[in-house]
Interface confidence: medium
């Protein structure tokens, strides 16, 4: 059956994918389309109740910090 990711395993996988950037359980506001759906889709909906791959997990990483110029 489809593989799902829940609880502590979900957090562990997010830490693997996102590193110290951190992550959100809901996509950051303004992610992708500017039109927000209601209710907001979260990672538990996408990866625990359904299956998702590592690229999908990456969508829940915190945004990259802007590069500081030397």
């Amino acid at each position: 059956g489809p593989e799902t990711l829940c609880g502590a395993e979900l957090v562990d996988a997010l830490q693997f994918v996102c590193g110290p950037r951190g992550f959100y359980f809901n996509k950051p506001t303004g992610y992708g389309s500017s039109i927000r759906r209601a209710p907001q889709t979260g990672i538990v909906d996408e990866c625990c109740f359904r299956s998702c791959d590592l690229r999908r997990l990456e969508m829940y990483c915190a945004p990259l910090k802007p590069t500081k110029s030397a």
């Epitope: 395993e9 996988a13 802007p66």
Partner: antibody
């Protein structure tokens, strides 16, 4: 001490299958996610697949998605990689690596795909 | 996707200091943890530096890591012949292309 020992490599024809194993000891096996990483002859390292510590979640590199399957048996402290539809470009040494930092590696097992 | 670029080779004489760079393209690696691996000839990779600058137990303090902006660096001081190896940086599941360190003489 932590020990990871791979086995199951060998020579296989294109389109064939192999199953690699990685036997683990010296740590609490069920507390760590595991990965397979490969290295083609004379080339660099390429991450292949990831499995969460309970085994309920897996992830794959695009190059192997749909052909390889990672699994684990937490009662036997063993990690597996089932490789189907093998191609010449899958020829490599395959390593199992522990955790998300790849802090321990096995010695590797060579897979050669050739006719 | 993250791409990590390393110089193909570096060299130095025994006792010298060498550095190996790891540069991220299209993503700011300053937001990630960078890990470094050493692969001696004919052996499996070994974790050398994790989380940018931390050394696992057993790794000599001649090895150090740092990170700034879009690049990370591995420094080796007091170069020894046994340091001759391939060195790889990584971010999560992405590896750099590797750098071959040659110890001269």
């Amino acid at each position: 001490q932590v020990e990871l020992v791979e086995s199951g490599g060998g020579l296989v024809q294109p389109g064939g299958s192999l199953r690699l194993s990685c036997a683990a000891s010296g740590f609490t096996w069920s507390s760590f996610a595991m990965s397979w990483v490969r290295q083609a002859p004379g080339k660099g390292l390429e991450w292949v697949s990831y499995i969460s510590y309970l085994g309920s979640y897996t992830g794959y590199a695009d190059s192997v998605k749909g052909r390889f399957t990672i699994s684990r048996d937490n009662s036997k402290n063993t990690l597996y990689l089932q490789m189907n539809s093998l191609r010449a470009e899958d020829t490599a040494v395959y390593y199992c690596a522990r955790g998300t930092k790849f802090d321990y590696w096995g010695q590797g097992t060579l897979v050669t795909v050739s006719s | 996707d993250i791409v990590l670029t390393q110089p193909p080779s570096v060299s130095g004489a025994p006792g010298q200091r060498v550095t190996i760079s790891c540069t991220g393209s299209s993503s700011n690696i300053g937001t990630y943890d960078v890990h470094w691996y050493q692969q001696l000839p004919g052996t499996a990779p070994k974790l050398l530096i994790y989380s940018n600058s931390k050394r696992p137990s057993g790794v000599p303090d001649r090895f150090s890591g740092s990170k700034s902006g879009t690049s990370a660096s591995l420094a080796i001081t007091g170069l020894q012949s046994e340091d001759e190896a391939d060195y790889y940086c990584s971010i999560t599941r992405v590896f750099g292309g590797g750098t071959k360190l040659t110890v001269l003489g």
